[in-house]
Amino acid sequence: MAVTACQGLGFVVSLIGIAGIIAATCMDQWSTQDLYNNPVTAVFNYQGLWRSCVRESSGFTECRGYFTLLGLPAMLQAVRALMIVGIVLGAIGLLVSIFALKCIRIGSMEDSAKANMTLTSGIMFIVSGLCAIAGVSVFANMLVTNFWMSTANMYTGMGGMVQTVQTRYTFGAALFVGWVAGGLTLIGGVMMCIACRGLAPEETNYKAVSYHASGHSVAYKPGGFKASTGFGSNTKNKKIYDGGARTEDEVQSYPSKHDYV
């Protein structure tokens, strides 16, 4: 039950995260005109990964796409690439995780296959989240650098008579959406990986045998070898006495189809 909940929650959190990454990538407000300590303009500028926009006091908003690839800064291209990779990985992760969900039955899919799919989707979500966080952070760093550069030469004038105020840009809403969404996708991925541990079945090399003693029943359960997921901690053979009472370690590992107690 706990595994199903962890896996389900991981899926939902990742789904929200990836939706957020998509939203952030499409948003126009990656950088917005800095209004602090600046002359109040009747024009508000903001920019996204794909186009820049101007909202006028009159209520008119005009957006223009970046209709060039080669003319754009390398950093912007890198951010675009990171966000797209994040979305693609996240989308594939979602697709894989749907089939991996414990609550969904697809034919006679083994638990081991579901565990592997859960782990795969978890890793994909983690990488997707990291891509989004990296993309947003690179853009934020670029903004900070440009902000201080434009502050240094805020007023460029002709002999001190005519002044041109340089438009400074600060963090837009998309950056915060991206950071939160990337974090959620990352958390969702970690939850999927944790759920994978519980899904990994206990595979044995031989069938378990029940021994019935005359006094009280004693069941002997060989531990055998774990599936090669590397997540198993229970590698010892355990004896269970007192009519099938389990040790603390064993309560954590879920019974497999070979358990006869």
């Epitope: 024009v43 101007v54 209520g59 005009e62 005519v162 041109t164």
Partner: antibody, heavy 120, light 112 residues
């Protein structure tokens, strides 16, 4: 046809107050940014205040800040300018204007104006 | 506040003549975001409210005769009337539409 009709002007003593009104017709009033502009007896044009369409943000000239309030009633299609602590330098012809939505913040329509005289 | 300086303050012209008037702003009215200039020109005839002629420094408002041309960028702007007609005799104002407070020039009076 777009029409802006101002009213409420008149003679007032220094320190007195006045409320100007502007009834708009022929366009969706609530979505347009509106302004008040005054013309002094010397024929100089001076922007007074602006209220942003939709958002309702307001901007004021430094010379009137704290003494003048711009507001709107979209249900009545009316723009207001509440003036208090009037001074002699507030004597002017007050125009109600509309900022055109594709005119780069330029005022595409003006009313005929209402005259305000501040004198003892 | 942005200072708008218009020159000359008055112009005496004959019908059919070409007229040029200037407007200079103390700060650039060019927006880097869309590379547009936020400057408007208005015409005011006696006893009438101002009428919008040019916006965005160079775009003619609908219904304005094509003899009126706006040009310039940044801080220096010009309004040209290619062939003055009797009905063009008025006061012409330039206005900063970029910074609050919006400011107007003192005007250029066109007279015969």
């Amino acid at each position: 046809e777009v029409m802006l009709v101002e009213s409420g002007g008149g003679l007032v003593k220094p320190g007195g107050s006045l409320k100007l009104s502007c009834v708009a017709s022929g366009f969706t009033f609530s979505s347009y940014t509106m302004s008040w502009v005054r013309q002094t007896p010397e024929k100089r044009l001076e922007w007074v205040a602006t209220i942003i369409g939709g958002y309702g943000n307001t901007y004021y000239s430094d010379s009137v800040k704290g003494r003048i309030t711009i507001s709107r009633d979209s249900a009545k299609n009316t723009l207001y300018l509440q003036m208090i602590s009037l001074r002699s330098e507030d004597t002017a012809l007050y125009y109600c204007t509309r900022l055109g939505q594709t005119q780069r913040n330029a005022m595409d329509y003006w009313g005929q104006g209402t005259s305000v005289t501040v004198s003892s | 506040d942005i200072l708008m300086t218009q020159s000359p303050s008055s112009l005496s012209v004959s019908a059919g003549e070409k007229v040029t008037m200037n407007c200079k702003s103390s700060q650039s009215l060019l927006n880097s975001g869309n590379q547009k200039n936020y400057l408007a020109w208005y015409q005011q005839k006696p006893g009438q409210p101002p009428k919008l002629l040019i916006y965005g420094a160079s775009t003619r408002e609908s219904g304005v005769p094509d003899r009126f041309t706006g040009s310039g960028s940044g801080t220096d702007f010009t309004l040209t009337i290619s062939s003055v007609q009797a009905e063009d005799l008025a006061v012409y104002y330039c206005q900063n539409d970029y910074y609050y407070p919006f400011t107007f020039g003192a005007g250029t009076k066109l007279e015969l």
